[in-house]
Structure formats: structure tokens, C-alpha cells
């Protein structure tokens, strides 16, 4: 008789997940010497324990403390750069802008990256199936219980002058339910942060609005400005020049300090 | 070292044509996005025009826009601005120049610039 | 479309501190940059991003930017200082230079 398995609303596990974390841990610890010293065989085992065996709508911050600790790493506090809703062009821009750091260029933000992972109450199986979603399901989700986790310890991390990237092509440009909007702005300390600078990716040169009004950017600006954050927005209407220095790294216009 | 060197300026009647040529060395000229600038006698800096890296848009001050056309060859590394009828006001140094390639969006190197006179 | 507005003229003595400002609708809301401009010469940009010298521009040149006012600040101005300063925004579609400043050294 085939056991009966709950139906969650999300897709399920990405495909060879183990196969992928471990591989993906390798990879960055070679690329990078700071992190030489992690076992990855060690960081595997700590994710499978955060959510093997729980049910996946009970995850909770502490089952992903084992991993934290494991991926502890000092990323420069003042070269922060946080995103909402445009991941692809923060992350061109930080290969471009060396040292610059978005969450993903941390090794657990690494690992995670566009993967979803779940498991089973009382099984030690992965759930290749399907998966909570955040909405139709459960927001204690082994995914969102980890992005929540690390984003909060990533913006609580940051100083001096923090930039975030932010989409002004959608409806809301700043979104309070999204991880920035919910997380990261909440958990950036006053006593280390001076200034939140907002980078508003315009969808093209065409559009001259100056986005820096919107009301949901003066909303950010107040949730700031309360917490004795200095707020600053700047309007960035060429997005495709991240391209070009995609293309051309090397070039010193593209590797001048931010 | 970047360097951009104009030519095609010179005298040219009202209502005439000209156009200006602007040769890029000593960089990777199809990633850059391009412009050109004026200065007319004892006056300041105007923003004439600009060209996106693979020329695929172009952008007009508003008192050159249906005369003015620029274009580039990324082959020959050479930026074009095309000036048809030309007015007395349309008088000054135009210079090529170069848009910085990252977050900040501001023009990084010029070239020495090319005089047009129009004139009767 | 925004409007860029400088003063005509500042003077500074030697050694001095020179400001030069640049005044906008909200212009805090975009990255400004400044050029100098010698007689007979091109444009050289000596600040951009608001407040991000070049490689190659001293140390004494800064800039700052925010509310409608940007600011060029030459500390312990020099002879060779003496040049035309403009301002320069992009705005969407189009950049915006301001009308320029004359900078003289007395």
C-alpha cells in the first residue's frame, strides 16, 4: 500500500539538491580563502538537519543555528548591498563590483540560491514532490525560515552606508512584505548604520520620472528615518551599463571605487 | 589610454548639412554607451545627444531633435552626429565623449572637440 | 525636466576654501558630477557620483549633495585651480549640465 504523502501548494525539492549544496560548497571554498577551513561535508549534514525529519511548516530559526554557525564569515560591513525584486542585476552588478556583497555572495547565501528544499515529519526523505508554499501553505517553511534567518543576520551585519537595489519598474518599488521590506530594514542597527542608500533601477533611459518620490520609497524613507537611519534615494536610469562592464570587467571604469 | 579625436567640423551656410566623425582608441569602443556635447562661443556646456553601447537607442536635446542624428560604427570604432538643417545658434565646439560603464551615470573622458560655424 | 543653476562667478583667495553650488529640484535624487574647464581645452571631470574623485584629481577637490543643493568644495585652493566648473546630471533621457561657474583665484 502506498504511503500516503501530504500534497503541498509549492514545488518540491530542486533536483539532486545534496548533490548541488555540497558541490556548490566545494566550489566556494576553493574561490574563496577565507572560507577554506569549512567542511563541507559538515555544512551538509548541519542543512539536512534543519529540516529532515521536521515537519515542514514547524521550522524554526534555531534548527538553522548548527548551519549558521558553521557558515560564519566576515564580509566587509560597509560594502553591503541589499536588493527587492531584482536579484539579477544586484548580482551582475557585485561580480562587476568586487567588492561590493550581496547576501548570495555569502556562503550560505550561496548554497541556497534559487533552490527549495523540504522534508517529511518522522522520515528522513527529502520531499521531491512538492513543497509549503509561503503563502497557500505556511510561512515556517524550511525555505523561508532559512532566507529570513540569514537575511537578518546579513542586515544586521551591515554599517556605515548600506545601498539596496530596488525595482521601480513594479507597482510597489518598496515592498513591506518582501525579505527587504520585512527583514533586512528592521534588522539594520542604528548604532552601526549611518546612512540606507536606494539605487531605483528605472526599466529604461526613456522613463525620466523621479522615482525617488514614489510613495512607497517615502514610506521606506519614514520606517528609516524612525529608526535614526539617515535615508538617501538616487535614480539610476541606465541599468544596461551593467552589462557592458559584464562584458568588460577589467576596463577601469568599471572597477573604480563605490 | 582612452582617446577620442573629432573631425568633420568647419563653415557651413544656414539650412546646410554637416557631418561630424569621432575616432575612439584605447578602449573597448561597442561596450561603451556615447555622446556628444557643445559649447558655443563664451557659453556653457550643452548635452547634444547620446547612443547606447550597440546603438540600439539614441536621445536628442529637445533643440536638435528631428535635425540631428547620431549613430556609430562598432567595427570601425567611429561615432557619427549627422546635422541637417543647420541653424546660426547650432554654432559651437562639439565634443565626443564617453559615459562612464557602472552604477554612476556621468561622461569620463572627452575628446578636444570640433568647431562648427554656421554662417552666410 | 530638471534645471541645473550655478553662480556666475566665485572667488577665492589662495589657500582658501572654494565652494561652488549647484542647485536643482530635488537633485539629491540624482548623482551629480563636476567637470573644469581651462580656456582652450576640453572638459576634465574631477568629480563623479556626487562625491567619488577620478584617479589622477587631488585630494583638496570633494563634492556633496543632497535636498536641491549640490556642492563643489576646493579646499586650499590653488592658482591652477582657476577654470570654469559645470556641474552634469542625467535625468532620463537626456543629461543636464548647469550653466557653469567661473572660478578665479585673486
Known amino acids: 500500500v502506498p504511503r500516503w504523502r501530504q500534497q503541498w501548494s509549492g514545488p518540491g525539492t530542486t533536483k539532486r539538491f545534496p548533490e548541488t549544496v555540497l558541490a556548490r560548497c566545494v566550489k566556494y571554498t576553493e574561490i574563496h580563502p577565507e572560507m577554506r577551513h569549512v567542511d563541507c561535508q559538515s555544512v551538509w549534514d548541519a542543512f539536512k538537519g534543519a529540516f529532515i525529519s521536521k515537519h515542514p511548516c514547524n521550522i524554526t530559526e534555531e534548527d538553522y543555528q548548527p548551519l549558521m554557525k558553521l557558515g560564519t564569515q566576515t564580509v566587509p560591513c560597509n560594502k553591503i548591498l541589499l536588493w527587492s525584486r531584482i536579484k539579477d542585476l544586484a548580482h551582475q552588478f557585485t561580480q562587476v563590483q568586487r567588492d561590493m556583497f550581496t547576501l548570495e555572495d555569502t556562503l550560505l547565501g550561496y548554497l541556497a540560491d534559487d533552490l527549495t528544499w523540504c522534508g517529511e515529519f518522522n522520515t528522513s526523505k527529502i520531499n521531491y514532490q512538492s513543497c509549503p508554499d509561503w503563502r497557500k501553505d505556511c510561512s515556517n517553511n524550511p525555505v523561508s525560515v532559512f532566507w529570513k534567518t540569514v537575511s537578518r543576520r546579513f542586515a544586521e551585519a551591515a554599517c556605515d552606508v548600506v545601498h539596496v537595489m530596488l525595482n521601480g519598474s513594479r507597482s510597489k518599488i518598496f515592498d513591506k512584505n518582501s525579505t527587504f521590506g520585512s527583514v533586512e530594514v528592521h534588522n539594520l542597527q542604528p548604532e552601526k548604520v549611518q546612512t540606507l542608500e536606494a539605487w531605483v533601477i528605472h526599466g529604461g533611459r526613456e522613463d525620466s520620472r523621479d522615482l525617488c518620490q514614489d510613495p512607497t520609497i517615502k514610506e521606506l524613507e519614514s520606517i528609516i528615518s524612525k529608526r535614526n537611519i539617515q535615508f538617501s534615494c538616487k535614480n539610476i536610469y541606465r541599468p544596461d551599463k551593467f552589462l557592458q562592464c559584464v562584458k568588460n570587467p577589467e576596463d577601469s571604469s568599471c572597477t573604480s571605487e563605490i | 589610454q582612452v582617446q577620442l579625436v573629432e573631425s568633420g567640423g568647419g563653415l557651413v551656410q544656414p539650412g546646410g548639412s554637416l557631418r561630424l566623425s569621432c575616432a575612439a582608441s584605447?578602449?573597448?569602443?561597442?561596450?561603451?554607451?556615447m555622446s556628444w556635447v557643445r559649447q558655443a562661443p563664451g557659453k556653457g556646456l550643452e548635452w547634444v545627444s547620446a547612443?547606447?553601447?550597440?546603438?540600439?537607442?539614441?536621445y536628442y536635446a529637445d533643440s536638435v531633435k528631428g535635425r540631428f542624428t547620431i549613430s556609430r560604427d562598432n567595427s570601425k570604432n567611429t561615432l557619427y552626429l549627422q546635422m541637417n538643417s543647420l541653424r546660426a545658434e547650432d554654432t559651437a565646439v562639439y565634443y565626443c565623449?564617453?559615459?562612464?560603464?557602472?552604477?554612476?551615470?556621468?561622461?569620463?573622458?572627452w575628446g578636444q572637440g570640433t568647431l562648427v560655424t554656421v554662417s552666410s | 525636466d530638471i534645471e541645473l543653476t550655478q553662480p556666475p562667478s566665485v572667488s577665492v583667495a589662495p589657500g582658501q576654501t572654494a565652494r561652488i553650488s549647484c542647485s536643482g529640484d530635488?537633485?539629491?535624487?540624482?548623482?551629480v558630477s563636476w567637470y573644469q574647464q581651462k580656456p582652450g581645452q576640453a572638459p576634465v571631470l574631477v568629480i563623479y557620483?556626487?562625491?567619488n574623485r577620478p584617479s589622477g584629481i587631488p585630494e583638496r577637490f570633494s563634492g556633496s549633495n543632497s535636498g536641491n543643493t549640490a556642492t563643489l568644495t576646493i579646499s586650499g585652493t590653488q592658482a591652477e585651480d582657476e577654470a570654469d566648473y559645470y556641474c552634469?546630471?542625467?535625468?532620463?533621457?537626456?543629461?543636464?549640465f548647469g550653466g557653469g561657474t567661473k572660478l578665479t583665484v585673486l
Open positions: 565623449a564617453r559615459y562612464y560603464s557602472g552604477i554612476y551615470q556621468h561622461i569620463d573622458y
Open positions: 584605447g578602449f573597448t569602443f561597442s561596450d561603451y554607451a
Open positions: 547612443i547606447r553601447y550597440d546603438g540600439s537607442n539614441t
Open positions: 530635488n537633485i539629491g535624487h540624482y548623482y
Open positions: 557620483g556626487d562625491n
Open positions: 552634469a546630471s542625467d535625468v532620463g533621457s537626456l543629461d543636464v
